[in-house]
């Protein structure tokens, strides 16, 4: 019986959300000794890389210099060691942002609330879209999808300090083409709570993270990036 190699990791650097006309690199990490990597886009072969020397390289990069809506979609990669191919990677949803318009994000009852208070975000965009996405900065990349003619509601329910952080929203023209990001809304959750165990505050990226959707590229964080992206994309799907 023909065996297959473990699937590779796939992720985008600096981020899977790419402003139009900006560059992005799709990374595929397989095994040392892999002689060929293939990148597939929407099910078809998109690019091939043959690392040299293969025994010293376990990762390849596919560079996209100018992001646009035609390049946005689902990517996967595979690699080959000898005649043996790997399982395909998870799907990477590459999203083009800064398309068309900018939504407005607001939060009720306000940006500062008491622990346990019910909070709802509202994302509004007057142009033709019916899908909206709410994202919270931080490696766990909380993504919610909402629908509405010009506005979507995102009820967070009773909040805890784990909900603290900076939120932005996007209008989505399709799964892979998003609007400009809204202005950020910082949610502050205060409250002295007796005998209540709360989740810790979510780690967040530096303040400039969202200007260009950059993730901090620290050594050893590549797999975190892949998981971060994958978590968000699963929620998108």
């Amino acid at each position: 019986q023909q065996q297959t190699l473990p699937k590779p990791f796939i992720w985008a650097e600096p981020h899977f959300m790419v402003p139009k006309e900006k560059q992005v690199t799709i990374c595929c990490q397989g095994n040392y000794g892999a002689v060929e990597y293939q990148l597939h886009f929407e099910g078809s072969l998109f690019a091939v890389d043959r690392p040299k020397p293969p025994e010293r390289i376990n990762k390849v990069k596919f560079y996209i210099p100018d992001m646009n809506s035609r390049m946005a979609g689902q990517y996967s990669c595979i690699y080959r060691v000898g005649e043996l191919w790997s399982e395909p990677s998870n799907l990477l949803d590459l999203v083009v942002t800064e398309m068309y318009d900018t939504p407005t994000l607001s939060v009720h009852p306000g940006p500062e609330v008491i622990s346990g208070e019910k909070v709802t975000f509202y994302c509004r965009l007057d142009t033709a879209t019916s899908m909206f996405l709410l994202l919270k900065e931080g490696r766990s990349s909380h993504v919610q999808r909402g629908y509405g003619k010009v506005q979507a509601e995102f009820p967070l329910g009773p909040v805890t300090t784990a909900h603290r952080g900076t939120y932005r929203c996007f209008g989505s023209y399709n799964n892979h083409a998003w609007s400009f990001p809204s202005e950020p809304v910082k949610l502050l959750v205060t409250g002295d709570i007796e005998n209540t165990s709360l989740a810790p505050e979510d780690p967040t990226f530096p303040a400039d993270t969202w200007g260009t959707y950059l993730l901090t590229t620290e050594t050893g964080l590549q797999k975190d990036h892949a998981l971060w992206d994958h978590t968000a994309q699963n929620l998108l799907r």
């Epitope: 607001s106 009852p109 306000g110 940006p111 008491i114 346990g116 502050l188 205060t190 002295d192 709570i193």
Partner: antibody, heavy 116, light 107 residues
Framework: QVQLVQSGAEVKKPGSSVKVSCKAS????????MHWVRQAPGQGLEWMGG????????SYNQKFKGRVTITADKSTSTAYMELSSLRSEDTAVYYC?????????WGQGTTVTVSS | EIVMTQSPATLSVSPGERATLSCRAS??????LHWYQQKPGQAPRLLIK???QSISGIPARFSGSGSGTDFTLTISSLEPEDFAVYYC?????????FGQGTKLEIK
């Protein structure tokens, strides 16, 4: 319909404490925070603090911190505001108000007079 | 804390005329600004929420505008029952703060 009914007027000595109640009806008590706002005679409105009844989270105006305690009893849909170490300048009407974004419903007010 | 400043302190207007009340925040509060009306011996009543959103049961002559630091409450044609004290409130940050009030009196 939403109603907030407060306890009756109180006359207190300086240095003592007062506890005012606010019974809510007409909505799910735990789904909204309850706040306390006071108004001294001839003066404006002053926020004292609020509570989230579902988990007991509170937020206080630093001006009152240490003297004010806000609690809630979900079983009776009642919020309480206790103010200690009373002084003459605490003479005021005390209101409870539901925060439904803004303060959309208010109690009728409780007059607390601090006098020796 | 965010300081809310209302002007004028007292506004004298005749019934049927238009009244414009101002409220300024010491820092930007976006549209997290609410307006209340209070009559003697009564609790405050919500008039406008989030700077411009109308409230069910409140007459259409009451409207609000503004964003950031400067806000306005407009009463298009004053009725006798509109003479009262009006307060704006910061709903953005704790401590939640109120303006000192504008007394609307009959001219």
């Amino acid at each position: 319909q939403v109603q907030l009914v407060q306890s009756g007027a109180e006359v207190k000595k300086p240095g003592s404490s007062v506890k005012v109640s606010c019974k809510a009806s007409g909505y799910t008590f735990s789904e909204y925070t309850m706040h306390w706002v006071r108004q001294a005679p001839g003066q404006g409105l002053e926020w004292m603090g609020g509570i989230s009844p579902n988990i007991g989270g509170t937020s206080y105006n630093q001006k009152f911190k240490g003297r004010v305690t806000i609690t809630a009893d979900k079983s009776t849909s009642t919020a309480y505001m206790e103010l200690s170490s009373l002084r003459s300048e605490d003479t005021a009407v005390y209101y409870c108000a539901r925060r439904g974004g803004s303060f959309d419903y208010w109690g009728q007010g409780t007059t607390v007079t601090v006098s020796s | 804390e965010i300081v809310m400043t209302q002007s004028p302190a007292t506004l004298s207007v005749s019934p049927g005329e238009r009244a414009t009340l101002s409220c300024r925040a010491s820092q930007s509060i976006s549209d997290y600004l609410h307006w209340y009306q209070q009559k003697p011996g009564q609790a405050p009543r919500l008039l406008i929420k989030y700077a411009s959103q109308s409230i069910s049961g409140i007459p259409a002559r009451f409207s609000g505008s503004g964003s950031g630091t400067d806000f306005t409450l407009t009463i298009s044609s004053l009725e006798p029952e509109d003479f009262a004290v009006y307060y704006c409130q910061n709903g953005h940050s704790f401590p939640l703060t109120f303006g000192q009030g504008t007394k609307l009196e009959i001219k």
